[in-house]
């Protein structure tokens, strides 16, 4: 009886794993083995595919074959018993185009209100992604184990920290990789769960802001308690993209080591041009806080995106705010030749309830105010360019009293 050649051959490539699956053509014939040959583009001869010779099952692995993943190859299969079937040729394919990104490795660290996620490619030193290692981005889905309500976080790199979590709570997450340059989306990792710790005695510093004064950077933050010492560290932002390397060499800012105030001043020449991450930690001598949220600090933007200067004209039920160019030292206005959007925050002096207005115009009306009431206003500028999504620090607050009633005309 003539052997039929196998059919429906599927090539599955995940990272550097090359798997072939096929269907037997004739289930009734026992003790059949299968063998594959392969042919590279521009070659006439067929070569035996190592790892896929005389296979008794309907699956084989040819990962050991050192292929050029960007070069098209063709496969053929036949069944063998006493005699052999005719060859069945599989459509030619390019491994890189066919490859899927496998599940990444995930490593979690817990704090009281944060989780640090370290992500590595699933295959270390992968041949398939050798030219794309730095192009991987990741996305994750995270949920509280108790609720199951999912939150998605897109476009993260090999180190990501999620803040504002609840203490003593189990969070679960899964991560997948993407190579946007090749339109490839990977397979999710297994689910990883971790419980945040009991609440720390000392909270981390908050609201870190960098501003420029003369030739110095001024770093300010808020802290709950007095009589603390603080230290500030920096890291090159691009290091968060480094795949597989999870040793982050945070550096101390010398003028910001063991400072006793909630600000520190250091010369601009501490940093060369670039994008950095900054973080602050508090200590009372016995206990240490966890690190603050990391803020991104771009020396290029910081140098020119200064807080706006504004004047207020007070009416009985509103303020008219006129925004002008920020001043450099020496009182000369800074020319900012890129479009800005202004965020104006105002509040009643006796209350903490803030209201916000976002405006492109440089003259803004703050409506619905009460007469003879002191309101405070602060403002900051944001760049409108998508790629240059940066913000200035807030200006100092200016407080004014509204006029008596009936002066709104």
């Amino acid at each position: 009886k003539n052997l039929k050649s196998p059919q429906k051959v599927e090539v599955d490539i995940i990272d550097d794993n090359f798997i072939l699956r096929w269907n037997r053509s004739d289930e009734s014939v026992g003790n059949v083995t299968f063998s594959f040959d392969y042919q590279k583009t521009g070659m006439d001869n067929w070569i035996k595919l190592s790892g896929c010779q005389n296979i008794t099952s309907t699956k084989c692995n040819f990962s050991s074959l050192k292929l050029n993943v960007y070069e098209e190859i063709k496969l053929r299969i036949r069944a063998e018993k006493e005699n052999t079937s005719s060859w069945y040729e599989v459509d030619s394919f390019t491994p890189f185009r066919k490859a899927q990104i496998g599940p990444p490795e995930v490593h979690l660290e817990a704090e009281d209100k944060a989780i640090v996620i370290h992500i590595s490619p699933g295959t270390k030193d992968s041949v398939m992604w050798a030219l794309d290692g730095l192009s991987f981005t990741y996305s994750l889905v995270i949920w509280k184990n108790s609720s199951g309500v999912e939150e998605r976080i897109e476009n993260i790199y090999s180190r990501h920290k999620i803040y504002k979590l609840s203490p003593e709570t189990t969070y679960c997450l899964k991560v997948k990789a993407a190579l946007l340059t090749s339109w490839k989306i990977g397979v999710y990792s297994p689910v990883h769960c971790i419980k945040t710790t009991v609440e720390n005695e000392l909270p981390p510093p908050e609201n870190i802001e960098v501003s420029v004064q003369n030739q110095n950077y001024v770093l300010k933050w808020d802290y709950t308690y007095a009589n603390m010492t603080f230290q500030v560290q920096w890291l090159h932002a691009f290091l968060k993209r480094n795949p597989g390397n999870h040793l982050y060499k945070w550096k101390q800012i010398p003028d910001c080591e063991n400072v006793k105030t909630t600000q520190c001043v250091f010369p601009q020449n501490v940093f060369q041009k670039g994008i950095y991450l900054l973080r602050v930690q508090a200590s009372d001598g016995n206990n240490t806080s966890f690190w603050s949220e990391e803020i991104k600090f771009d020396t290029e933007i910081q140098a020119f995106l200064l807080p706006p200067v504004f004047n207020i004209r007070s009416l009985s039920d509103s303020f008219h705010i006129y925004i002008g160019a920020p001043k450099q030292s020496g009182n000369t206005p800074v020319i900012q030749d890129y479009p800005l959007i202004y965020e104006i925050i105002f509040w009643e002096n006796t209350s903490n309830a803030e209201r916000k207005i976002i405006e492109k115009k440089t003259d803004v009306t703050v409506p619905n105010l009460k007469p003879l009431t002191v309101y405070c206003v602060k403002a900051r500028a944001h760049t409108m360019d998508e790629k240059l999504n940066k913000s200035s620090v807030f200006s100092d607050a200016v407080c004014e009293k509204t006029k008596p009633g009936n002066t709104s005309k």
């Epitope: 490593h107 660290e109 704090e111 710790t197 005695e201 060499k249 101390q252 966890f290």
Partner: antibody, heavy 118, light 107 residues
């Protein structure tokens, strides 16, 4: 294969100083931290300090500030621990260790025994 | 400095048994804790990092757990080659302090 090869045992007199070495193979020390740890006989481990060989930045445990100086020579892939004004309290085994991913000490040298005696 | 306390200096166990070595931090260190094994006359060997992750090549009978201030190294199905001293260490902040060690004796 990652290895940290430490210099041989030392016998020195009180008041003298000594320089211990730790030569790495299988990795580039610039990509890691190198730590030094002290262990006295039948006692626990004490962290002395560490160096970032990439830029020479060092950190020391307060107890070893002024006693220990850590340096590195990236051309020979070697880190050094210099101990000064030695006393019998400095008699111990000194280990170098690699600070790897997530800051943990993933590989250790075989240790150098230092004896301070007159 | 953060103090790491291993309250049991010695522990005795039988081959095949399960034993838990504990370690307490003087303040919350998250999950930034490692465990090391030191056999007599040898240098320490890394077993566990980030409280619960096993280094490659470490047998899966070694398990780390805990977070915040309380950490445990569990050895299930103890083998004679596990006779050693076990140290915990915090890597949350400088200095990288170690526990005093727990010596495991095999009966």
């Amino acid at each position: 294969e990652v290895q940290l090869q430490q210099s041989g045992a030392e016998l020195v007199k009180p008041g003298a100083s000594v320089k211990l070495s730790c030569t790495a193979s299988g990795f580039n020390i610039k990509d890691y931290y190198i730590h030094w740890v002290k262990q006295r006989t039948e006692q626990g481990l004490e962290w002395i300090g560490r160096i970032d060989p990439e830029d020479g930045e060092t950190k020391y445990a307060p107890k070893f500030q002024g006693k220990a100086t850590i340096t590195a020579d990236t051309s020979s892939n070697t880190a050094y621990l210099h101990l000064s004004s030695l006393t019998s309290e400095d008699t111990a085994v000194y280990y170098c260790s690699r600070g790897g991913n997530f800051y943990y000490f993933d590989y250790w040298g075989q240790g150098t025994s230092l004896t301070v005696s007159s | 400095d953060i103090v790491m306390t291993q309250s049991q200096k010695f522990m005795s166990t039988l081959v095949g048994d399960r034993v838990s070595v504990t370690c307490k931090a003087s303040q919350n260190v998250g999950t930034n804790v490692a465990w090391y094994q030191q056999k007599p006359g040898q240098s320490p060997k890394a077993l566990i990092y980030s409280a619960s992750y096993r280094y490659s090549g470490v047998p899966d009978r070694f398990t780390g757990s805990g977070s915040g201030t309380d950490f445990t190294l569990t050895i299930s199905n103890v083998q004679s080659e596990d006779l050693a001293e076990y140290f915990c260490q915090q890597c949350n902040s400088y200095s990288y302090t170690f526990g005093g060690g727990t010596k495991l004796e095999i009966k």
